[in-house]
Amino acid sequence: AAPCPDACCPHGSSGLRCTRDGALDSLHHLPGAENLTELYIENQQHLQHLELRDLRGLGELRNLTIVKSGLRFVAPDAFHFTPRLSRLNLSFNALESLSWKTVQGLSLQELVLSGNPLHCSCALRWLQRWEEEGLGGVPEQKLQCHGQGPLAHMPNASCGVPTLKVQVPNASVDVGDDVLLRCQVEGRGLEQAGWILTELEQSATVMKSGGLPSLGLTLANVTSDLNRKNVTCWAENDVGRAEVSVQVNVSFPASVQLHTAVEMHHWCIPFSVDGQPAPSLRWLFNGSVLNETSFIFTEFLEPAANETVRHGCLRLNQPTHVNNGNYTLLAANPFGQASASIMAAFMDNPFEFNPEDPIPVSFSPVDTNSTSGDPVEKKDETPFGVSVAVG
């Protein structure tokens, strides 16, 4: 094949090599960019910055090599458009540092940075951690910090992510209240901070205030839906990111629902209770307190992480006719109480008959399973009905 005269030449089915001295100063408008999986760049002393726009449209890129060039700066979001990138070789450039954000979200199997005049500061703590943990082939490179020494020796005692403290109101919060949260951010080299409120939806009207190092958040006219929803404060510095989540407890009165008894492994009278704080429960059977035993007991289902409502069952292990009757669930918390009742019939009473009525017995003269000619009682196979009154 004839030698390629261009700055960048195809290499294999989906690769591109750019090795002609000084031909590039940016990566805009590379030919066939959208299908590239491999990009090799060498001897480009004018290529000094790598930014978000440079790699736009290179969504299939897996291997990127920029070596023996003039690269001085790689933007924290440079690889936003190349989420499949797994090999990154930036050796023998002029990089003094590389932000943790640059590689965040990538699954890099290999990261090569040797031959750069790296400068050790807390901003390279993430890279030191990669070296310690054997990630990305970093340990083999024995990275040096220019003028200082091996990256492995960099002191890191003061290289922490920000520390966050979120103050929530001590007092009880009621539906309709306004709530002020404050996030206090401490640490060196603070860069950005904010709130994540994705779970809140219609739970309150949100107003943000303040900035580093003290962020305010007002949740106005809160609803009971705010319970169990995470309000998250985050902050970033050159070392990394920290997040702290809190929940605001909005008080509201107890409520309860009962449903038709269903036969599972045991019988179950399903219920749902809600309220904040979580209500205390008590069962009544035919108006009297029901003392729970190993045969009749309350069982809760695994609660959903983001709601206060609890679902469960009153479990009845092989109930008989003596368990038929009216079941009432009482729920109470400091803000109110509620009850719901339901009739449950588990079995007909076998002794409810008139002595003058004939005993319901059937004879099976051809019954081969019977060892004697004794009569065999036949169970009533008619399904019984349960009427439900949901309170």
Epitope: E96, P117, H119, S121, C122, A123, Q144, H146, G147, Q148, G149, P150, H153, M154, P155, A157, S158, C159, R188, G189, L190, N237
Partner: antibody, heavy 119, light 106 residues
């Protein structure tokens, strides 16, 4: 023990060059970066540049770029700093200092070399 | 370049006094160094990465701080402590020094 011994005082004319030496002993010379710092009379400390004797890698403060040359001779464990196009404001005490990466600081300093630039 | 501002530029104190020197960086730094220099002598390392004592440095010297604000404290000033003290950062190139604080006898 670790020692850095510098060459003696120099008097130079403006426009001339000066070459200061720094002989290291008591440690492996090629393992640690050697830095050069200067101090004008009655003034504070000013970083000039650094050399890695293991491979001659260098870095300089922008201010001295193009005017300072850092070299080393591994056979004698000696680092050199040459400053050209001297001006009167280059009159200062020039120090070499080792960056000790085990504890991450400039732990040992030479005794200093006084360079006077005067017509 | 990161600028290092020391205060005060000079102070007079008596033996036994507690002395505090502050150093402020123009932007947040990872750690700080302190040096002591006596007339005609090379700087002597006192404190490395913010709070660790250099070899042979008496325990009356201590360093603290984070971000942009750092402090060198001499808990009980001794006759041999009268000197000029410099702070130095190396969070980014080039390493830069404070202007110095001269501690004189009152």
């Amino acid at each position: 023990q670790v020692q850095l011994v510098q060459s003696g005082a120099e008097v130079k004319k403006p426009g001339a060059s000066v070459k200061v030496s720094c002989k290291a002993s008591g440690y492996t010379f090629t393992t640690y970066w050697m830095h050069w710092v200067r101090q004008a009379p009655g003034q504070g400390l000013e970083w000039i540049g650094t050399i890695y004797p293991g491979n001659s890698d260098t870095s300089f403060a922008q201010k001295f770029q193009g005017r300072v040359t850092l070299t080393r001779d591994t056979s004698t464990s000696t680092a050199y700093m040459e400053l050209s196009s001297l001006r009167s404001e280059d009159t200062a005490v020039y120090y070499c200092t080792r960056f000790y990466f085990e504890d991450w600081y400039f732990d040992v300093w030479g005794q200093g070399t006084t360079v006077t630039v005067s017509s | 370049d990161i600028q290092m501002t020391q205060s005060p530029s000079s102070l007079s104190a008596s033996v036994g006094d507690r002395v505090t020197i502050t150093c402020r960086a123009s932007s947040s730094i990872s750690w700080l160094y302190w040096f002591q220099q006596k007339p005609g002598k090379a700087p002597k390392p006192l404190i490395y990465y913010t709070s660790s004592l250099g070899s042979g440095v008496p325990s009356r010297f201590s360093g603290s701080g984070s971000g942009t604000d750092y402090t060198l404290t001499i808990s009980s000033l001794q006759p041999e402590d009268f000197a000029t003290y410099y702070c130095q950062q190396w969070h980014s190139y080039p390493p830069t020094f404070g202007g110095g604080t001269k501690v004189e006898i009152k």
